[in-house]
């Protein structure tokens, strides 16, 4: 299968700038935007701190930590109202991502 210029392989994502026009589905990650070409039953998400295609049920149920959004060795916790997640680095620094 040959891909046209700008076309993404199925199941892959790329980071795009906020002002770039695209008809592909997008999900804001921190303040980045990802353009993903996800397979059926998948949706744009975050895995290991990078944009990825994840099971759509994770998004629907807001069980963000099931995406494995944090780096290996970091702990993941849901924000109280499931509006996002925190990654806790070894040593205790936290990084919070909210989903709009």
């Amino acid at each position: 299968q040959f891909l046209k210029e700008g076309q993404l392989a199925a199941g892959t994502c790329e980071i795009v700038t906020l002002d770039r026009d695209s008809s592909q589905p997008r999900r804001t990650i921190a303040r980045q935007t990802a353009r993903c070409a996800c397979r059926k039953g998948q949706i744009a998400g975050t895995t290991r701190n990078k944009p990825s295609c994840v099971d759509a049920r994770i998004i629907k149920t807001k069980q963000w930590c099931d995406m494995l959004p944090c780096l290996e060795g970091e702990g993941c916790d849901l924000l109280i109202n499931r509006s996002g997640w925190t990654c806790t680095q070894p040593g205790g620094r936290i990084k919070t991502t909210t989903v709009s």
């Epitope: 780096l71 925190t86 680095q89 070894p90 040593g91 205790g92 620094r93 936290i94 919070t96």
Partner: antibody, heavy 114, light 113 residues
């Protein structure tokens, strides 16, 4: 609107103990870490320390022992400074420390002079 | 001891020109990319420009570009404007369990000719 405001800065004499307060609004301290940074007049930025929700604070090597960061309420983080010297004269900032430090407070000026 | 060396310490540029500021860390930053850039004007707190080495902060002009990983990072300002006159700082994040969590570079003062 996410905001931080520092208070407590004033003119003190060497040897004094002073506590600065960072009051936050628009976000929760249970979800974000806060760093304290200082800037001596005409000099660069110097990181003092960091505190996250339920974790022990972390300090710059030079700040250990004389500086103490604590979360004093759901909206305030304190910076306690002991045995102040003229070298501690600076504007002290607090900032939400997440993906970079953003936003910052306007700063509070501490002047140590005899 | 953690150290971030910023070069040059001062730089001049004409309106419309391009400026490059370098930041070298004495050890790799966390995840090889946890480095931020700030702009500070006199009497104001620093303003976040770039985080995660290359991600533009919200509301920041795309004339600012960050690159690099590990220990070597660069901030490039293209099509320089009068309003860009300021001091620029890099800030590296490190593992809190093994070292200082954060460190700042010494700053680079940008003068517009």
């Amino acid at each position: 609107q996410e905001q931080l405001v520092e208070s407590g800065g004033r003119l003190v004499t060497p040897g004094t103990t002073l506590t600065l307060t960072c009051t936050v609004s628009g976000f929760s301290l249970s979800s974000y870490g806060v760093s304290w940074v200082r800037q001596a007049p005409g000099k660069g930025l110097e990181w003092i320390g960091y505190i996250a929700n339920n974790y022990n604070p972390h300090y710059a090597s030079w700040a250990k022992g004389r500086f103490t960061i604590s979360k004093t309420s759901s909206t305030t983080v304190d910076l306690k400074m002991t045995s102040l010297t003229t070298e501690d004269t600076a504007t002290y900032f607090c900032a939400r420390d997440n993906y970079g430090m953003d936003p910052w407070g306007p700063g509070t000026l501490v002047t140590v002079s005899s | 001891e953690l150290d971030l060396t910023q070069t040059p310490s001062s730089v001049s540029a004409a309106v419309g020109g391009t400026v490059t500021i370098n930041c070298q860390a004495s050890q790799s930053v966390y995840n090889n990319k946890n480095l931020a850039w700030y702009q500070q004007k006199p009497g104001q707190p620093p303003k976040l420009l770039i985080y995660a080495a290359s991600t533009l902060a919200s509301g920041v002009s795309s004339r600012f570009k960050g690159s690099g990983s590990g220990t070597q990072f660069t901030l490039t300002i293209s099509d320089v404007q009068c309003d860009d006159a300021a001091t620029y700082y890099c800030q590296g994040e490190f593992s809190c369990s093994s070292a200082d969590c954060n460190a700042f570079g010494g700053g680079t003062e940008l003068e517009i000719l």
